[in-house]
Amino acid sequence: EVEKTACPSGKKAREIDESLIFYKKWELEACVDAALLATQMDRVNAIPFTYEQLDVLKHKLDELYPQGYPESVIQHLGYLFLKMSPEDIRKWNVTSLETLKALLEVNKGHEMSPQVATLIDRFVKGRGQLDKDTLDTLTAFYPGYLCSLSPEELSSVPPSSIWAVRPQDLDTCDPRQLDVLYPKARLAFQNMNGSEYFVKIQSFLGGAPTEDLKALSQQNVSMDLATFMKLRTDAVLPLTVAEVQKLLGPHVEGLKAEERHRPVRDWILRQRQDDLDTLGLGLQGGIPNGYLVLDLSMQEALS
């Protein structure tokens, strides 16, 4: 708290300008009118106020707007946004995408702070769903944003928004998240032709079921190994050697390097060794010729 002291003669601020950087904390408190500050918030960011000076300016706004700042002030907070607590932000009603962009710009290039996370949460909840423009904006500032959402939160993403998603936005998504996103992507891209469809759907395939992988194997897609390694193990296991060969095309040779890793390792264990041998890659560990798998869960073999 800054002590209430009278403003020295001739120091009363008539406008928010650069001369204020020479004011001490108590002078800012005494000589800057909160209403003037609120109407000239757009000027604050143009002036190099220190951490301590911003504290005083925030205090003045808090006194003027105890129930939360109006959006006209929020949009122009600039670096003052960094002084806000999540509790402050929860009092706000941010509806404009321009306001969101302006505040995200302040923290650009830095990790998502609790303030930013709260702001985004407030904004998205206010909109009711994560629409395309919002998703576009958020992933531009935070490529990992989508993967920070729970599967429940992702369920509110409309398929139309999927067009805004770039491959790098999904880098940190886990299988549970891709399970939610994949059907939306499939719906979003359903009217595209084969090769274009594959380019778009590729980064979502970690959520694809077996039947969709089988369908893709019929389309000469030449899936790369990096994508294959991200597929759900339970979706890969039922694929035949012929289907995997068609799915990977020329990339099938890469299976050898990955034979000890999932899902390749588990898939190999499910294939007949003579089928694996047809690939000519030297993959070992398949079911020996003449053996029959009766219990898939235990993989007991009888001669």
Partner: nanobody, 114 residues
Framework: VQLVESGGGLVQPGGSLRLSCAAS????????VAWYRQAPGEQREPVAA???????IYADSVKGRFTISRDNAKNTVYLQMNSLKPEDTAVYYC??????????WGQGTSVTVS
């Protein structure tokens, strides 16, 4: 954000120095910036500032002697100090934008006028 100040040193009264401050990213090209100084036992105080629009302002004690400028291409801010006095002795810092608001400072560069 990294701020690296340089150019300080020992100088005789009446002499000149040019301080430089380099920042990572494109921090200085888009933000208001300022030079500050801290004399031994004193609080850090602003000496010169440049708004994001390019206008400049100086503390009364350095007016007419110090000039702040910036090179956006090099992402560097300068402080040209002429007619130096013993009372200008201090550690000089530059800052602006995100790091200033977050209270992150560089190591500063020491100026001694003697």
């Amino acid at each position: 954000v990294q701020l690296v100040e340089s150019g300080g040193g020992l100088v005789q009264p009446g002499g000149s120095l040019r301080l430089s401050c380099a920042a990572s990213g494109s921090m200085f090209s888009i933000n208001a910036v300022a030079w500050y100084r801290q004399a031994p036992g004193e609080q850090r105080e602003p000496v010169a500032a440049m708004t994001s629009g390019g206008s400049t302002i100086y503390a009364d004690s350095v007016k007419g002697r110090f000039t702040i400028s910036r090179d956006n291409a090099k992402n560097t801010v300068y402080l040209q100090m002429n007619s130096l006095k013993p009372e200008d002795t201090a550690v000089y810092y530059c800052n602006g934008g995100w790091s200033l608001a977050m209270n992150y400072w560089g190591q500063g560069t020491s100026v001694t006028v003697s």
